[in-house]
């Protein structure tokens, strides 16, 4: 998630939205400016063609494996479960995502030549694929519980519901996603290359944190409180009941939901901390911002490369994903029949298991 | 990389007039504040006067009608015309600029840094 960062963050930030020109020096003068050492913004140096390779590649393995994803479950019509629509949807959002890194790339060596419209564009997919990915997997926890620790599945096998509830996310996405909408914009300077960044003008420090605050707290703390709540009772049942089959089920599904924690919780709580010191609740040093600055470029790193992780999570533990393409790839005649497994269909979805599905 | 460099400090007699430039170059996005301060040995460094990107000026009450600080924001750079000098006024001059520069690998975040020049001599003295 970007960054979500309201980062045109003058001295006015300090002092809560207060005008600077009209403060009376005759007081004492904070810190910062008394303080001879100056205070010079750092991260992490890193050469720019090493970024644009690191883009080429998660480009390449996320277009390839998410295109691949979403092509098998749309083949599956017939035995498609609620979770592998909600896969479907994460499918999605990792491509939009993935097919912004060549412009990212790009403007990594010739600076931001696309202009406002596709600065907002780009970082408002970005931030959409991180939204959509922890509220779907939010979702397919709840899926989970209700089909393993209640045994119903009333509530998510209506069809409706669930495109429903899929839109809906969506929409909250982007909803969470408009500040990066409403203050991305390309800057011109007459000293570097242009460059899409959040420019918040003269909003006040009050509103700026506002604006981080909730899509921080709605976008990433509930969902994974709710993951944490489901997964939590969905475990216990499993290995209480000594449900080996569902167990096995439910691998694939653990895997995306750590691989996702390992990728963007790092980010995340160096984004809190930020917020925390933007909000005074932690003392704001130089020190600790350069710390925060170099942690969030360390972390970041890793959310990128989360859209390209799933297929390969699919492709490695998901024997129903693997039946699933080896099933496409024999319908058009790119390899042999004979070769495609006995217990082979075109779907994620194994064996049915009282009420839930071995997906993947 | 970012760097302010002074110039026009040096010896002048009492009621003499030096003026003193400050250029900043790098890669700078914007500059919001700059300002000279000055400081004599054994004291802290003061502020002298500082000016705002909108054109705001701020002096302190010892250099008022004497000091004028204007700056130029098409070369980045602020400038200290000191008029009337006085002994109290030797220090080293130190200019000071609140930078917004840009920071990051992955996505750029616009940061603002508190800048310092190395500090240039002024010796009012007869």
């Known amino acids: 998630m970007e960054d979500f960062n309201m980062e045109s963050d003058s001295f006015e930030d300090f002092w809560k939205g207060e005008d600077l020109s009209n403060y009376s020096y005759s007081s004492t003068l904070p810190p910062f400016l008394l303080d001879a050492a100056p205070c010079e913004p750092e991260s992490l140096e890193i050469n720019k063609y090493f970024v644009v390779i690191i883009y080429a590649l998660v480009f390449l393995l996320s277009l390839l494996g998410n295109s691949l994803v979403m092509l098998v479950i749309l083949y599956s019509r017939v035995g498609r479960s609620v979770t592998d629509v909600y896969l479907l949807n994460l499918a999605l959002a990792d491509l939009l995502f993935a097919l912004t890194l060549p412009i990212w790339a790009a403007s990594k060596v010739n600076g931001w030549i696309f202009g406002t419209f596709l600065c907002k564009v780009v970082s408002l997919l970005k931030e959409v694929n991180f939204y959509s990915g922890i509220l779907l997997l939010a979702c397919i926890s709840v899926d989970r519980y209700l089909a393993i620790v209640h045994a119903t599945r009333t509530l998510t096998q209506k069809r409706y519901l669930v495109k429903f509830i899929c839109l809906s996310i969506w929409g909250l996405s982007l909803l969470l996603a408009l500040p990066v909408l409403l203050f991305r914009r390309t800057v011109y300077s007459s000293n570097v290359s242009p460059a899409c960044y959040e420019d918040m003008g003269n909003n006040t420090a009050n509103w700026r944190m506002l604006l981080r605050i909730l899509p921080q707290s709605f976008g990433f703390i509930v969902p994974l409180l709710i993951m944490l709540f489901c997964y939590g009772f969905t475990l216990r049942t499993l290995f209480k009941a000594h449900m080996g089959q569902k167990h096995r089920a439910m691998r694939v599904i653990f895997a995306v939901v750590l691989i996702f924690l390992l990728c963007w919780l790092p980010y995340n709580l160096v984004l809190l901390a930020d917020t925390l010191m933007r909000t005074q609740v932690i003392q704001e040093t130089c020190e600790r911002r350069n710390h925060i600055d170099r942690a969030l470029d360390a972390t970041e790193i890793l959310g990128i490369l989360h859209s390209c992780l799933n297929p390969l999570i699919y492709a490695f533990i998901g024997q129903k994903f693997r039946h699933g393409l080896l099933k496409i790839l024999a319908i058009h005649g790119l390899i042999s029949k004979d070769s495609l497994p006995k217990d082979s269909r075109p779907s994620f979805v194994g064996s049915s298991s009282g009420h839930t599905s071995t997906t993947l | 990389e970012v760097q302010l460099v002074e110039s026009g400090g040096g010896l002048v007699q009492p009621g003499g007039s030096l003026r003193l430039s400050c250029v900043a170059s790098g890669s700078i996005v914007r500059i919001n504040t700059m300002g000279w301060y000055r400081q004599t040995p054994g004291k802290q460094r003061e502020l002298v006067a500082d000016?705002?990107?909108?054109?705001?000026?701020n002096y302190i009450d010892a250099v008022k009608g004497r000091f004028t600080i204007s700056r130029d924001n098409t070369k980045n750079t602020v400038y200290l015309q000191m008029n009337s000098l006085k002994p109290e006024d030797t220090a080293v001059y130190y200019c000071n600029a609140e930078i917004v520069v840009l920071v990051g690998v992955w996505t750029q975040r616009a940061r603002t840094g508190n800048y310092w020049g190395q500090g240039t001599q002024v010796t009012v003295s007869s």
């Open positions: 000016i705002t990107s909108g054109g705001n000026i």
